[in-house]
């Protein structure tokens, strides 16, 4: 805390400009009017204040706005935003996408900080849902943003927002998240034709059920192995050898290299060996010829 001292004669700040970087901390405290600072916040970003000086400027704003800063000030915080704590940010009411963009720009190129996470949380809660423009903005700054949300949070994403999602935005999503996103993507892209649809839906397929994979296998999509390896194991297991062959097209040869990894390994164990042999890939581990397969889950459902 800076002691309260009178401003020296002739040093009272009439505007926020570079002359203030020559002020000692106590002079800034004594000579800069908080209301002046609030109205000229946009100038701060161009001026190289030291961290210590920024602490004083923040303190002045905190005194002026103990209940939280108004959006007119927040939008122009510039690099003073880096001085804010999550507790400070929780007092804010940020409704403008322009304000959000301005503050994300300050943090650009860095990992998502607790401050940014709090800001985004406040913004999204204020809007009630993750609309397309917000999602566009957030994934542009933080490609992994979508995958940082819980399945519950993702449920508030409207299908229309899915158009803003790029494949790299889903790189770190786990199956539970894709389970939520896939139906939304399916809905969003439903009016597209076969090949275009597959291009768009491909990165969401880690949440696809068996029946959708069966449908895709009828459309000559030529799914690559990387996509296949990300499919839900429980969705892959019921697929027949013929269906997998159709689904992968020329990429079916890649199964050999992945035969020890899930979901390929588990799928092989469920197929008849003579069916696997028709692929000519030397896949081993299928059910030997002459053995009867009982689907116990089906039997339990019937009893």
């Amino acid at each position: 805390e800076v002691e309260k001292t009178a401003c020296p004669s002739g040093k009272k700040a009439r505007e926020i400009d570079e002359s203030l970087i020559f002020y000692k901390k106590w002079e800034l405290e004594a000579c800069v009017d908080a209301a002046l600072l609030a109205t000229q916040m946009d100038r701060v970003n161009a001026i190289p204040f030291t961290y210590e000086q920024l602490d004083v400027l923040k303190h002045k704003l905190d005194e002026l706005y103990p209940q939280g800063y108004p959006e007119s000030v927040i939008q122009h915080l510039g690099y003073l935003f880096l001085k804010m704590s999550p507790e400070d940010i929780r007092k804010w009411n940020v409704t403008s996408l322009e304000t959000l963009k301005a503050l994300l720009e300050v943090n650009k190129g860095h990992e998502m900080s607790p401050q940014v996470a709090t800001l985004i949380d406040r913004f999204v809660k204020g809007r009630g849902q993750l609309d397309k423009d917000t999602l566009d903005t957030l994934t542009a700054f933080y490609p992994g943003y979508l995958c940082s949300l819980s399945p519950e949070e993702l449920s508030s994403v409207p299908p229309s927002s899915i158009w803003a999602v790029r494949p790299q935005d889903l790189d770190t999503c786990d199956p539970r998240q894709l389970d939520v996103l896939y139906p939304k993507a399916r809905l969003a892209f439903q009016n597209m034709n076969g090949s275009e649809y597959f291009v768009k839906i491909q990165s969401f397929l880690g949440g696809a059920p068996t029946e959708d994979l069966k449908a895709l296998s009828q459309q000559n999509v030529s799914m690559d192995l990387a996509t296949f390896m990300k499919l839900r194991t429980d969705a892959v297991l019921p697929l027949t050898v013929a269906e997998v062959q159709k689904l992968l097209g020329p990429h079916v040869e890649g199964l050999k290299a992945e035969e020890r990894h899930r979901p390929v390994r588990d799928w092989i164990l469920r197929q008849r060996q003579d069916d696997l042999d028709t692929l000519g890939l030397g896949l081993q581990g299928g059910i030997p010829n002459g053995y009867l397969v009982l689907d116990l889950s089906m039997q339990e459902a019937l009893s």
Epitope: E18, P48, Y79
Partner: nanobody
Framework: QVQLVESGGGLVEAGDSLRLSCVVS????????MAWFRQAPGKEREAVAS????????IYADFVKGRFTISRDYEKNTIYLSMNNLKPEDTAVYYC?????WGQGTQVTVSS
Amino acid sequence: QVQLVESGGGLVEAGDSLRLSCVVSGRTLESYVMAWFRQAPGKEREAVASINWSSGRLIYADFVKGRFTISRDYEKNTIYLSMNNLKPEDTAVYYCAAGRYWGQGTQVTVSS
């Protein structure tokens, strides 16, 4: 992002001169105030001189007036700090800054 790289520091004797350079890359500077700061061991960082890139306005700290000169070269995106009649108390790490961006600093040591 803006990158600032200082150079020109060194060990000199009292009364000697040095010229520090700061090359800026990564973004246009029109909207920035650029400045030289210094930090002596155990002391707070303090502003030495500033130059407003768009208006050309120059400001100096009282303790360097008449001895130090800040200047700029548009074409080279560089600012300079010419330091004459150096004193032992000028010993510090000198930093260049543009808006929120700071360089890593260059050491100036003035022996008596």
